[in-house]
Interface confidence: medium
């Protein structure tokens, strides 16, 4: 003989009874009548349950809650089912024998029968687990029933403290749906808050769990499938203030089937969201977006921001969001960088594009622009890179595409090529009034549109000139000299320790800023416009350190222990970390800081000039850094202001050395035996480049690299080509992660080396 | 006078081992990579192996690589080459060479400045 | 690493011009832009004369310029001299803390 062996299945549910009605008391659990109520209504499930075949299986039950409307009672029960047969009784098959015993003409005196008349249509069965029960139990000392009427906002009030862990039960209208708001109002916190697409923290119904005060996302609104929902908040410290602001709606449910008819032309025409967008969407969410395009001359491009598509085994859900395009089934996953699907028009014109969300975990709400593209060339002058559908640069010696195809099969890599007999040159060369090749190709087309390309400048009419660099040389090039617009930069004022480096003399470096906090000099930084500093966004990582109002900016400084009449000091009123950055990878490190108030410039307060993004530094060349970083590896910030040049390194040296760890949006400069180099404290400040017409150009932002000064490896900069349309974008008011901005990180404040 | 000179050539048997030195002088040796090339009887130049000028930084050529060690002493101005398990194909006239410019963080991979070179034969 | 390919000889008249070719892969002469030519005469140790494909070390005769097309790069001489022939080597760097050279082309000034 041998024991049967068993195991506990837990479920969840809920049930509605008819001629019994919710009061304000059956909504306090430690209300007499809870009480009275709870264990009557606990006898009736066990005898539904005991009436049934799952009756011989019976172990223990609860009703732990009661709702609104025709009384809903909430409730869990434990079945020790034979290991055999686990499988064999999922929620549904459950459901259906208790529906059928509530149905049936049974002549039973039991009080589910007699008592109360349950509604076999509300009745509700989810799978639920023993730790899903000890999470309910350790909540109901804080156990909060609230039914969310049409129109009104709930504030939902912490944890006291006396209790760690709070549970809400939030109810609704049955054709509304539950939206709970969460706002964050401290820098610090161990909180957690974990929201259930049930009325119990059930993990399988789990939308979305937060830990810490997420500077990524200051403000979250979180959408339940339906008109229930479960919030848990479990404090982590002990604490007088709650460091976040709850509060919960009921909305209608939003619609998202579209048709959309696209224009010929190849701008962006529009966008595709998820309900209630930047909202997380929801567990139910089905949106299917059907665009049709003019012609099949073109394909149809989808923009994606910080969330990529890729293709998943179909055993495989997907976690976050289930997209369809053309009988294609794609998974969503969020990323940390841009990416574009672009859909090929074939046979016909029109695409359904259809997004699920396949479990109750969710995420941010999706936003996706569209766009057309020409099919016979999606690029014009760059490449198509398929890994990620962007167009990049091609072989100007910069590994844009995750599988290096760009840089592939190049014929000239960073240098221009003779259209007579394919040789290269270098691009300073080209448009110098001076032949290079063979029969003057590099002279050719110096004064009239070309077609755009890597190197090609681009202005503001969007036609392209060939010679490179044209901004601010003092020659118009472009039809509508936009090449010699917003020219007041990168002149220095008054004259003509960052490691290895000499002291700057006042107005050398009218761009420079100094980034304090109490008084005490953090980062560095530049002027690029007369409200706007740029700088490393790695400056911001730590909790301490996340609010603009901690910062000072000090422009034309010269000293740290002491003032001088060039010198300004400004407030921080906004901050923008570019959305992309990647603590861990130091990619994406810029930052952008609106002052306060605007800049009067002087011959010790300018802006640097911003560089194009088809701006070439040429390897080789000598730039300059300043800051006032320390003058040795571990030492102390410097004083003065230091300056030292640097020369700029080829990428592929640079990432050999680094083991490939250097991104597309970075640069290398320094030495082979280092010596001379950024270091702690010169964090965001500058690397400038002098370009011919005597203007300083602003190449790079000092961002990381392996010790200071350490032979064998040089310093690493934020490239400022690869982020300058951003930069532009949050310049002109086009957003970008304002306020908070990027992740919720923990690091040093300032030049990361290692 | 910028001036290399190779020695520690000679005839030997195969399997065995040799030491190459290379002395610089007229010049700041810790400030250039440094590098050996061969070449056997008419034949063309053979790149062996490079060091960069603070010993942190080693390549070599397929052929001699797990064999050959490349090694440099920057106090006394010397760069050496230990050969072992030495092959009849090693046979051949050994320069050493310096890496043209001592400024940049990368090389230019290119030799400015030679020696005379050191002939190793390999033979039974 | 497989050697970069050269012409074994290429000639010249006194006073003409001579381009000498040296194919390389993608990974080599076709990625990096560290192309070097060196020049030798016999018994000789070799002298560079071109180096970043089309960079002249002071004291190497304007005459001398170098190219490069794809993963091939070239070396041309202009106004052939007496003095010019001699045997000349192309180099490349190939990734990895590794050099490559040509197999060489003799270079022969006629009459």
């Known amino acids: 003989y041998k024991a049967e062996v068993t195991v506990s299945q837990v479920y969840s549910g809920s049930l509605r009874v008819l001629n019994r009605h919710f009061s304000q008391d059956l909504g306090r659990r430690e209300s007499i009548a809870f009480r009275s109520e709870s264990a009557k209504a606990q006898k009736m499930l066990q005898e539904l349950v005991a009436s049934t075949r799952l009756g011989t299986y019976y172990n223990s039950s609860s009703v732990y809650s009661f709702g609104e409307g025709p009384l809903t009672c909430f409730f869990w029960f434990i079945l020790d089912i034979p290991e055999y047969q686990r499988l064999t009784l999922s929620p549904e098959v459950v459901r259906e024998l208790l529906v059928d015993e509530l149905l049936s003409n049974s002549s039973t005196l039991a009080s589910y029968k007699t008592e109360y008349e349950v509604d076999p249509e509300g009745l509700v069965i989810l799978e639920a687990s023993v730790n899903d029960i000890v999470v309910l139990n350790s909540t109901l000392g804080c156990y909060r029933y609230s039914y969310v009427n049409p129109g009104q906002v709930l504030p939902l009030k912490g944890p006291d403290q006396q209790t760690t862990s709070c549970l809400w039960h939030l109810q609704g209208p049955e054709d509304l749906m539950i939206k709970v708001r969460l706002e964050w109002t401290r820098v610090d916190c161990r909180d957690r808050v974990a929201m259930y697409d049930a009325a119990g923290p059930l993990e399988k119904r789990l939308i979305t769990s937060v830990y810490g005060c997420s500077r990524q996302e200051p403000v979250m609104e979180v959408l339940a499938s339906g008109s229930v929902m479960a919030v848990v908040w479990k404090k982590g410290m002990h604490s007088y203030y709650d460091p976040f602001l709850l509060s919960v709606k009921s909305v209608a449910f939003q619609d998202c089937q579209v048709n959309l008819t696209l224009e010929g032309r190849l701008d962006t025409q529009g966008f595709l969201r998820t309900p209630y967008y930047p909202s997380y969407y929801s567990p139910s969410t089905h949106c299917s977006w059907h665009l049709t395009v003019p012609s099949l001359d073109y394909g149809l491009a989808l923009w994606f921001d910080a969330y990529a598509l890729r293709r998943q085994k179909y055993n495989r859900l997907c976690t976050q969001g289930q997209w369809m395009i053309q009988n294609r089934r794609l998974c969503g996953f969020r990323t940390l960088q841009p990416y574009a699907e672009r859909i090929p028009m074939v046979a016909s014109d029109g695409v359904t594009i259809n997004f699920t969300s396949q479990i109750s975990l969710t995420g941010p709400g999706v936003q996706v622009y569209y766009s057309l593209y020409n099919q016979s060339d999606p690029c014009p002058g760059e490449f198509l890179c398929s890994v990620n559908g962007l167009c990049v640069p091609a072989c100007d010696g910069i590994k844009d595409c995750p599988n290096g195809l760009d840089e592939r099969n190049c014929v000239c890599r960073a240098m221009f090529q003779c259209q007579e007999d394919s040789t290269c040159i270098s691009l300073p060369r080209v448009c110098d009034r001076q032949p290079d090749c063979l029969n003057g190709s590099d002279e050719e087309q110096c004064q009239e549109g070309v077609p755009c390309g890597t190197f090609t400048f681009q202005c503001e009419d969007r036609s392209c000139v060939k010679k490179p660099n044209p901004e601010c040389d003092g020659q118009s090039d472009c039809r509508d000299g936009s090449d010699e617009q917003h020219c007041d930069c990168g002149l220095q004022g008054l004259s003509s320790r960052i490691v290895g480096g000499t002291v700057s003399s006042e107005g050398e470096w009218p761009w420079q800023a100094s980034l304090q906090i109490r008084g005490r000099h953090i980062c560095g930084g530049a002027l690029i416009a007369d409200r706007w500093v740029i700088t490393a966004a790695h400056c911001f990582q730590e909790d301490s350190m996340a609010s603009p109002k901690l910062w000072t900016v000090f422009l034309g400084k010269m000293r740290q222990n002491s003032r001088w009449p060039g010198e300004v000091s400004f407030k921080v009123s906004r901050l923008f970390l570019h959305p992309y950055h990647e603590e861990d990878s130091h990619d994406y490190d810029v930052a952008l800081l609106q002052l306060d108030h605007p800049v009067v410039y002087s011959a010790t307060v300018r802006p640097v000039c911003l560089p194009a993004r088809s701006h070439f530094f040429e390897p080789g060349q000598h730039c300059w850094i300043t800051g006032w970083g320390a003058q040795r590896e571990g030492g102390p910030v410097s004083n003065t202001l230091q300056k030292v040049d640097v020369q700029l390194v080829p990428q592929d040296l640079c990432s050999e050395a680094y083991r490939y760890q250097v991104s597309p949006r970075m640069l290398c400069a320094g030495y082979r035996k280092g010596k001379k180099d950024a270091c702690q404290g010169d964090s965001g400040g500058p690397l400038v480049c002098r370009e011919p017409s005597g203007r300083w150009f602003l190449a790079g932002l000092v961002s990381w690299g392996l010790g200071c000064g350490r032979p064998n490896f040089f310093g690493v900069y934020t490239r400022v080509t690869r982020v300058i349309n951003w930069i532009q974008q949050v310049l002109t008011g086009g957003g970008g992660s304002g306020g908070g901005g990027s992740h919720h990180h923990h690091h040093h404040g300032s030049h990361h080396h290692h | 006078e910028v001036q290399l000179v190779e020695s520690g050539g000679g005839l030997v048997q195969p399997g065995r081992s040799l030491r190459l030195s290379c002395a610089a002088s007229?010049?700041?040796?810790?400030?250039?990579?440094m590098y050996w090339v061969r070449q056997a009887p008419g034949k063309g130049l053979e790149w062996v192996s490079g060091?960069?000028?603070?010993?942190?930084?080693?390549g070599y050529a397929d052929a001699v690589k797990g064999r050959f060690t490349i090694s440099r002493d920057n106090a006394k101005n010397v760069l050496y080459l230990h050969m072992n398990s030495l092959r009849p194909e090693d046979t051949a006239l050994y320069y050493c060479?310096?890496?043209?410019?001592?400024?940049?963080?990368?090389?230019?991979?290119?030799?400015?400045?030679w020696g005379q070179g050191t002939t190793v034969t390999v033979s039974p | 690493q497989s050697a970069l390919t050269q012409p074994p000889s290429a000639s010249g008249s006194p006073g003409q011009s001579v381009t000498i070719s040296c194919t390389g892969t993608?990974?080599?002469?076709?990625?990096?832009?560290?192309v070097s030519w060196y020049q030798q005469h016999p018994d000789k140790a070799p002298k560079v004369m071109i180096y970043e494909v089309s960079k002249r070390p002071s004291g190497v005769p304007d005459r001398f310029s170098g190219s490069k097309s794809g993963n091939t790069a070239s070396l041309t001489v202009s106004g052939l001299q007496a003095e010019d022939e001699a045997d000349y080597y192309c180099?490349?760097?190939?990734?990895?803390?590794?050099?490559?050279f040509g197999g060489g082309t003799k270079l022969t000034v006629l009459g």
């Open positions: 007229g010049f700041t040796f810790d400030d250039h990579v």
């Open positions: 180099s490349s760097y190939a990734g990895s803390n590794k050099v490559v």
């Open positions: 060091i960069s000028w603070n010993s942190d930084t080693i």
């Open positions: 993608s990974s080599d002469v076709g990625f990096y832009n560290f």
């Open positions: 060479a310096r890496e043209k410019d001592g400024d940049f963080y990368y090389n230019y991979f290119v030799m400015d400045v």
